[in-house]
């Protein structure tokens, strides 16, 4: 989905390369073609990252942290390519890299600044704690510290609790919001400014539905066009809240177009799914079907949560029997 890395050109032979944690990147360096090519990559002017001369690598004094993680584009060296292929970058790899390239004609040095970002896909969760309802936007691993903003009915809200845990190389962040008794829609945005990546979570509460036992109910779930891109992989999950925890009724994976149904009374309309409408039907309702139903549409860039409250009441017949 994402490029190997992206370069920002800045003056004075210095480039900024932005990479993602645990992914491979390229530190770019080019030179004027010439014979007797010598390439030395160093980190912070001290640690030997990679050395090449006399037609082969010389890694005897390579710093151990770079072992088996670096290589050059050997077939392109004679064309003036001294770029370094760097495997599995970590946050400890951030810093300034100097590429020294010498030939029989000239010697040049290029500086490359490596910045590493982390953005494991965030999640928006809906939780009940005793009598309170919470929305929680969380990201398990992110670096640098992200910007988290909340909106209620499209209006920014200042209340923004952040529970932050720092590990060796990234942050884990939870941002809970108490939405008890609210019928508003909520939106949470998490932005990683370094990776220029934004994720949005949106929560919508639908009007409560009152149904009689044995009837069926249709619950709507249609993505908001602002976020939804059918070309991007996403997952749709329908769940039911029972005694404080959600149990999955069914889910749909866009990549395989697979639908998995765990509740025999649940039905999905294939034609509607093809039109990106994930509304569902639940047949033959019984009293224990009362509760909250959650539709979760999630991709790498968004989570859309839609909540329906269903009240199933005894039918007249059942009532008269009792």
């Amino acid at each position: 989905i994402f490029p190997l890395a992206f370069f920002i050109y800045v003056p004075m032979n210095e480039q900024i390369v932005i990479g993602r944690l645990d992914e491979d990147i390229i530190l770019p360096s080019s030179f004027e073609r010439g014979s007797e090519v010598v390439i030395h990559w160093k980190y912070q002017d001290s640690y030997k990252v990679h050395s090449y001369y006399k037609g082969s690598d010389h890694l005897e004094s390579q710093d151990p942290r770079y072992a088996n993680r670096t290589s050059l584009f050997y077939n392109e060296i004679q064309n003036g390519n001294a770029s370094l292929f760097f495997r599995r970058v970590s946050l400890l790899d951030e810093g300034i890299y100097t590429c020294y390239v010498g030939t029989a004609i000239q010697v040049i040095t290029n500086k490359v600044v490596l910045k590493v970002g982390v953005f494991l896909t965030p999640v928006m969760k809906y939780e009940k704690r005793n009598t309170n309802s919470f929305l929680i936007c969380s990201v398990l691993s992110v670096y640098p510290r992200p910007i988290i903003t909340w909106k209620m009915d499209n209006t920014p809200i200042s209340e923004n609790n952040m529970e932050e845990t720092g590990s060796l190389d990234s942050f884990s962040i939870n941002s809970p919001l108490n939405i008890t008794g609210s019928n508003s829609s909520y939106e949470c945005t998490i932005e990683n400014s370094l990776l220029k990546q934004t994720w949005t979570g949106r929560w919508t509460m639908k009007d409560g539905l009152h149904k009689m036992q044995s009837e069926h109910v249709s619950l709507s779930c249609q993505p908001v066009n602002d976020y939804f891109s059918p070309n991007q992989d996403f997952k749709v999950t329908w769940s039911r809240m029972k005694s404080g925890t959600f149990s999955v009724l069914a889910y749909y994976l866009s990549s395989s177009q697979n639908t998995i149904i765990n509740e025999s009374r649940f039905s999905w309309n294939k034609e509607l799914i093809n039109q990106s409408d994930f509304s569902m039907n639940l047949m033959d309702l019984n009293l224990s079907d009362s509760g909250e139903y959650l539709c979760n549409i999630s991709s790498d860039e968004y989570t859309l949560l839609t909540i329906h409250t269903v009240h199933v009441e005894p039918s007249q017949e059942t009532a008269s029997h009792n």
Partner: antibody, heavy 120, light 107 residues
Framework: QVQLVESGGGVVQPGRSLRLSCAAS????????MHWVRQVPGKGLEWVAV????????DYADSVKGRFTISRDNSKNTLYLQMNSLRVEDTAVYYC?????????????WGQGTLVTVSS | DIQMTQSPSSLSASVGDRVTITCRAS??????LAWYQQKPGKVPKLLIY???TLQSGVPSRFSGSGSGTDFTLTISSLQPEDVATYYC?????????FGPGTKVDIK
Amino acid sequence: QVQLVESGGGVVQPGRSLRLSCAASGFTFSNYGMHWVRQVPGKGLEWVAVIWYEGSEKDYADSVKGRFTISRDNSKNTLYLQMNSLRVEDTAVYYCAKDLISGIYYVDHWGQGTLVTVSS
Amino acid sequence: DIQMTQSPSSLSASVGDRVTITCRASQGISNYLAWYQQKPGKVPKLLIYAASTLQSGVPSRFSGSGSGTDFTLTISSLQPEDVATYYCQKYNSAPFTFGPGTKVDIK
């Protein structure tokens, strides 16, 4: 143009020390490896030592290993050769020389040399 | 360490003669060999590197060949100004040993 000027030579007794300097100009000193090569008057060339462009790697001829130390100060564009425990057989003209590239190739420019005489 | 030998140690030839100097390494050094010329009372000057590549400004009558352990320096037509001592040097890895030199003069 490349200029290398050695200094610090002279007469010294066996067992004593001497430090040679080489002032470089006309090129980006910090980009190039540097060598010391010596020559007994009327005899052949003997390679003595090399230092890489940034000073990280050094190598020596067996005949001087443990007694001579090559170093450089890139901010002063100067190469040094610290010679300790001098012997009579160290008597020679000492040339400062520029490597083609980083310190792993041949010499493409030479200084005029400075004479070191070790004698009791 | 690899030893470098040169032959002959000295030679006399007439102006216009073709002169060949041999340099031998005790182990293979690929083509990492340079040739220098040192005229009497002067500092050495680079003639050839990578066994056969002529340094810029060096007359084309000088040429080099060889690879591995055996190398030659050839002066196709000896000139009076070529009177000098010629040294080979290996640079595949340190120590960057010189050969003992070949002294060339005019008959």
